[in-house]
Structure formats: C-alpha cells, structure tokens
C-alpha cells in the first residue's frame, strides 16, 4: 500500500535538485577564487539538512544556519544592487558592471536561483511531486524561508549607497509584500547605509512619465526616510540603452538621459 503523501499547491522540487545544486556550487567556486576553499559536498549536506525530514511548513531561519555559515562571503558592501520584479535586467546589469552584486551573484543566491525544493516530515525523501505554495499553503516553507534568510543577511551587509532596480511596468512599482519590500528594506542598517537609490525601469518605449512620482515610490521614500536613510530616485527610460551605456560609457549617445 503506497504511503499517503501530502499534496501541496505548488510545484514539486526541481528535477535533479541535488546534482544541480552541486554543479552550481562547483562552477561558482571555480569562477570565484575567493570561494575556492568551499567544499561543495559539505554545502550540499548543509542545504539538505535544512529541509530533509522536516515538515515543509515548519522551516525556520535556524534550519539554514549551517548553510549560511558555509556560504559566508564578503561582497563590497557599497556595491550592492537590490531588485524587485525585474530580476533579468538586474542580472544583465551586474554581468556587465562586474563590480556590482545582486544576491544571485553570491554563492548562496546562485545555488538556489529559480529552484524549488522541499522534503517530507520524518522521511529522508525529497518531494518531487509538490511543495507548499507561499499563499495557498504556508509561508514558512523551505524556499520562502531560504530567500528570507539570505535576503535579510544581504541587506544587513549593505553600506553607503545601496541601489535597487524596480519594475516601472507593474501596477505596484514598489510592493510592500515583495522580498525587497518586506525583508530587505527593513534590514538596511541606518548606521551603515547613507542612501537608497531607486532605479525605476520603464517598459514602454514612448513612456516619458516621471515614475519617481508614483504613489508607491513615495511610500518607499517614506519608509526609508523614517529609518533615517536618504532616498533618491531615477527614471531609466530606455533600459536597452542603459545597458549599452554601461558596456560602452564613452559612447557619444550616452551623455543624454537614459
């Protein structure tokens, strides 16, 4: 008789999850000399230990501490780029502007980017059938708790001017319920962070509105100001040109507004 298995509302663990995590770890440590000391098998063991045999709605930040310890990494605290609902452009940017870092440019973020995982209470099995959905099932699931943990640590490490890329095409340009709005904003350290600079990315080619005046941006400014951090905002009207000018800043067309 097959053992009853909890059916969750979200997709199951990504196929080949263990091998994918390991392969990413090996690749990352090869590319980043400062992380060459990391033993990827130990990283996998710590990752697995955070959720295997545990109820997937009862995961805590504490469960991830061994993994956090192994993945400890120093990034230049004044070169941090946060993002919300515009991951691809943020990553394209840091691929060109190599001295700036998103969370996914760190080892732990790189390992887990776009992956799903969960286990089952009291069994050593990975659940490839379904995992809890944040809204429909529970918020304390392995994936959500992981991103909350690494995002908090990433924001806490930031200093000086912190940049955030926001999606100007969305109805809520700043969303209080996003990871940026619910975790990162509240974990920037006022004693270290002088300014949060928002880059609002325009979607429409002919969109010349000043999206820095959007009510949700004003809400973000209010939250940040109350935390004793200065706020500034820039419209990026032409994201394609913006990237091109990051690649070739000496281009004559890059002196005009982008």
């Amino acid at each position: 008789v097959p053992r009853w298995r909890q059916q969750w509302s979200g997709p199951g663990t990504t196929k080949r999850f263990p091998e994918t995590v390991l392969a990413r770890c090996v690749k990352y440590t090869e590319i980043h000399p400062e992380m060459r000391h990391v033993d990827c098998q130990s990283v996998w063991d710590a990752f697995k230990g955070a959720f295997i045999s545990k109820h997937p709605c009862n995961i805590t930040e504490e469960d991830y501490q061994p993994l956090m310890k192994l993945g400890t990494q120093t990034v230049p605290c004044n070169k941090i780029l946060l993002w919300s609902r515009i991951k691809d452009l943020a990553h394209q940017f840091t691929q060109v502007q190599r001295d700036m870092f998103t969370l996914e440019d760190t080892l732990l973020g790189y390992l887990a980017d776009d992956l799903t995982w969960c286990g089952e209470f009291n069994t050593s099995k990975i659940n490839y059938q379904s995992c809890p959905d944040w809204r429909k099932d529970c918020s304390n699931n392995p994936v959500s708790v992981f991103w909350k943990t690494v995002s908090r640590r990433f924001a806490e490490a930031a200093c000086d001017v912190v940049h955030v890329m926001l999606n100007g095409s969305r109805s809520k340009i700043f969303d209080k319920n996003s990871t940026f709005g619910s975790v990162e904003v509240h974990n920037l350290q006022p004693e270290k962070v002088q300014t949060l600079e928002a880059w609002v990315i325009h979607g429409g080619r002919e969109d010349s509105r000043d999206l820095c005046q959007d009510p949700t941006i004003k809400e973000l400014e209010s939250i940040i100001s109350k935390r004793n951090i200065q706020f500034s905002c820039k419209n990026i009207y032409r994201p394609d040109k913006f990237l091109q000018c990051v690649k070739n800043p000496e281009d004559s067309s890059c002196t005009s507004e982008i």
Epitope: R16, F17, E19, A23, R24, V26, K27, E30
Partner: antibody
C-alpha cells in the same frame, strides 16, 4: 579515489550482460553524476548514459535508449545493463565521475566486452 | 542530439612546435566544453573544462579557447609525451537533461 569496472568478457549475440563500476575512496551517497562511455577498438569515445546519485535521474544517448539501463545499485556501485547484444557493442566500457559542472575528472581503466559467436 | 565535429583527424608536428585542434558544435553550448587526452590502453584524462579552464595538474602548455559553437585546443612547446589522441566533449547540464557528445578525436604525432 578510484573507479574500477568489471563484468566484461566474451558474450553471445542477442545475449545480455551487466557491467559494474565500483567506487573506492569516496561514497556515491554523496552527490555525483556517474557516466558510462564506450570505445570500439581503434575508434573514438561514445557517451552512453549518466545517472545522478542524489536524484536517481538518468540520461541516455538517443541510440542507447531502450537497450541500456544505468542504475545506482549501492553506495559504492553503479551498474550498466545491456540487452540484445550485437557485434557493434564490442568495445572497452569506461565509467567516469562528474563531481559537478561537467568535469569528468575520474575514470576507471575500462572493461572489454566482446560480442561474438 | 548535439554533434561535435573535430578537425583534423590527425596532425604531425615536431618537438617544440605548436598544434591546433578545432572542435565545432552543431548548436551553441556556451562554454560547456571539455578536452581530454587519451594514450593507448589508458582511459581519457581531463585537460580542460569550461572551454578554457585548465584541470588540476595539467601543464600550461595546453590552452583552450572559444565559446558558442567554435572551440580550439592549442598545445605549444610540443613534447614527445604529448603524443596521444585528443577529444573534445560537450556537456550541457540542466535541471532536465545531461546530454553529452564527444568529437571524433585528433591523433597528435610528435616527430
């Protein structure tokens, strides 16, 4: 750390066989991708199949699907089963370990399979 | 399936010389390419992975380059111990598949 293949020998056309790759110095309870490759006498390398030791997921070369089966049979062994043997299967069969990111850094010495009547 | 075309099939060069081996993939594979050296009666030995990264313990006389579909292995200051057959291998590791393909091999003869 080493890999050793076994199970080779002389086989009849139409028959079946099972080749074993034994790992020593490391455990397949850790996460690796283990692969089988063959090389006909005087010819090049030909990829057959791989298995992820963590997920158990397998991949096969298109030509190998159906007739070849790769499996992890213990914490130290990976097996390749072959059916409906023909003379074209005569080759040295190697197993190899990928510790991640496609780097096959450990190979066994190979085991020779001869299919002949 | 990805097809790897390796040229030339055989090359001869003098000790101290340079040899260039080319490998072409039938579809773009980024930098997911490895080079192996194989001597008679032995298993292949990993030389280069990620198109240009030297494997541990491999001489810097071996140099890999290229990305996308065109790749090159260059062996400089040729030594008699370099006489062997060299293979390129594409690997494409994703969460859904792990297809691999080897080139046909290039025999390097050192005079």
């Amino acid at each position: 750390q080493e890999l050793v293949e076994s199970g080779g020998g002389l086989f009849q056309p139409g028959g079946s066989l099972a080749l074993t790759c034994k790992a020593s110095g490391f455990s397949l309870s850790n996460i690796y991708v283990m692969c089988w490759v063959r090389q006909a006498p005087g010819k090049g390398l030909e990829w057959i199949a791989c298995i992820g030791t963590g997920s158990g997921d397998t991949d096969y070369a298109t030509w190998a699907k159906g007739r070849f089966t790769i499996s992890k049979t213990s914490s130290t062994t990976v097996t390749l089963q072959m059916t409906s043997l023909t003379a074209a299967d005569t080759a040295t069969y190697f197993c190899a370990r990928d510790p991640g990111a496609g780097t096959w850094n450990l190979w066994g010495p190979g085991t020779l399979v001869t299919v002949s009547s | 399936d990805i097809v790897m075309t390796q040229t030339p099939s055989s090359v001869e060069a003098a000790v101290g010389g340079t040899v260039t081996i080319k490998c072409q993939a039938s579809q773009t594979i980024g930098s997911r390419l490895a080079w192996y050296q194989q001597k008679p009666g032995q298993p292949p030995k990993l030389l280069i992975y990620s198109a240009s990264t030297l494997a541990s313990g491999v001489s810097s006389r071996f140099k890999g380059s290229g990305s996308g579909t065109q790749f090159t292995l260059t062996i400089s200051d040729l030594d008699s111990a370099d006489a062997a057959t060299y293979y390129c291998q594409s690997y494409y590791y994703t969460s859904t598949s792990y297809p691999n393909a080897f080139g046909g091999g290039t025999e390097v003869v050192v005079k």
